[in-house]
């Protein structure tokens, strides 16, 4: 049966993103619709059509446009994606003899990590701390030169949709530490990093 | 030029089925819709059905509740619309059209199939 | 199904007549409305597509308009040749259904 072909896209927030719809039909639709899928029902966003060309509903004036003008390739464009915007779109394409075949395309909203790394001396011990802020939330590791060494991890989420993993390392004796390198290593989308620290007696 | 030339009258007995053929010439026969209407006598138009040359989707008017099917065979740039189980009340002229989109311009001449015992 | 609904269903004019023929939707069907022209033993032939675009070809004396339950065609000076049956057809939502036909003779 006829059908269409959509790719979900993953991007930065306060960047542009698009998402396109391509009707695999020998003919071009009479009218293509755009909704955001909601709890209830979708909400229509825009449409295109030769009568009436594009059409944006109010919420969404100033935030998308149909950048691809086509009845059998559609595409639309956010021009600055915020958190709001992640979800799920529906393209309809209302077709002469097939009715609405639709598909959907979904946007996933990424914040890059935001790392810090420092270290304490405290009397006989030793605590490096590691955070990373970002959104989806990140993984964080230790590289350290030995085994054995303990660490805490706490994960706090903020409500500007980022998430915050902040791993301690506790080093016991500290003087042996002292001159040596330790690796944080935050893992985000699939992306490694490393964060070197080298430990100095303050 | 365009054209769609339709097979030859039938007659059939009840229960019988009838496959008629729409042939397609003077344009590429997958960028159109072929669509199948048909009018009894003294009746209105009605649709039965169409296909979509290129992939071979096709859709039907449930009314015919699975009797029709309307199927392609592109190498030939021919159209097939076949009736099962057939009655007296399907005695009719059979039209075969082709559009793009919403825009009806080329029709077939019309096939009668008349349905008695 | 949808039902279409043409009236009148016969009407009798003279050439040069102006002639309007409604034809009215059991519900919305937005612009999706064609009309066409069929003369006796003959395929029909079409006039107008998404309510009020004329086909190539047709004289610009036929012409559509309307949308959402109530449409019309009107042949602005009636010619010879344009006594037939009319005939018009929603496709807004399947399956697509005809109009009743009406038929126009002369006077």
């Known amino acids: 049966q006829v059908q269409v072909v959509t790719q979900d896209e993953r991007e930065q927030l306060y960047t542009p993103a698009s998402l396109k719809c391509s009707l695999q039909n020998a003919q071009e639709a009479l009218i293509v619709t755009w909704q955001k899928k909601k709890a209830v029902s979708p909400e229509n966003m825009v449409t295109f059509s030769e009568n009436h060309g594009v059409v944006i509903q109010p919420a969404y004036k100033d935030k998308i446009n149909i950048t691809q003008l086509g009845l059998q390739n559609s595409t639309i464009t956010f021009w600055n994606i915020t958190l709001e915007d992640e979800g799920c779109y529906m393209c309809l394409f209302n077709t002469f003899g097939f009715g609405k075949i639709s598909g959907t395309a979904c946007l996933t909203v990424y914040v890059q990590p935001i790392v810090s790394l420092h270290y304490k001396f405290s009397e006989d011990h030793l605590n490096i701390t590691c955070s990373a802020t970002a959104r989806p939330a990140p993984m964080v590791f230790w590289k350290v030169p030995r085994s054995g060494i303990e660490n805490s991890t706490v994960t706090l989420s903020h409500p500007n949709g980022t998430t915050s993993v902040t791993s301690i390392l506790h080093i016991k004796d500290p003087k042996n530490q002292v001159g040596k390198e330790v690796i944080c290593q935050v893992l985000h989308l699939g992306t490694v990093t490393d964060f070197k620290q080298t430990v100095n007696k303050g | 030029q365009v054209q769609l030339v339709q097979s030859g009258a039938e007659v059939k007995k009840p229960g019988a089925s009838v496959k008629v053929s729409c042939k397609a010439s003077g344009y590429s026969f997958t960028d159109y819709i072929i669509l199948w209407v048909r009018q009894a006598p003294g009746q209105r138009l009605e649709w039965m059905g169409h296909i979509d040359p290129y992939y071979g989707s096709s859709n039907y008017n449930l009314k015919f509740k699975g009797r029709v099917t309307i199927t392609r065979d592109t190498s030939a740039s021919t159209a097939y619309m076949e009736l099962n189980s057939l009655r007296s009340e399907d005695t009719a002229v059979y039209y075969c059209?082709?559009?793009?989109?919403?825009?009806?311009?080329?029709w077939g001449q019309g096939t009668l199939v008349t349905v008695s015992s | 199904d949808i039902q279409m609904t043409q009236s009148p269903s016969s009407l009798s004019a003279s050439v040069g007549d102006r002639v309007t023929i409604t034809c009215k939707a059991s519900?919305?069907?937005?612009?999706?409305l064609s009309w066409f022209q069929q003369k006796p033993g003959k395929a029909p032939k079409s006039l107008i597509y998404?309510?009020?675009r004329l086909v190539d070809g047709v004289p610009s004396r036929f012409s559509g308009s309307g949308s959402g339950t109530d449409f019309t065609l009107t042949i602005s000076s009636l010619q010879p040749e344009d006594f037939a049956t009319y005939y018009c057809?929603?496709?807004?939502?399947?399956?697509?259904?005809f109009g009743q036909g009406t038929k126009l003779e002369i006077k």
């Open positions: 519900q919305d069907i937005n612009s999706y």
């Open positions: 059209a082709r559009s793009k989109r919403d825009y009806f311009d080329y």
């Open positions: 057809l929603q496709y807004d939502e399947f399956p697509y259904t």
């Open positions: 998404r309510a009020n």
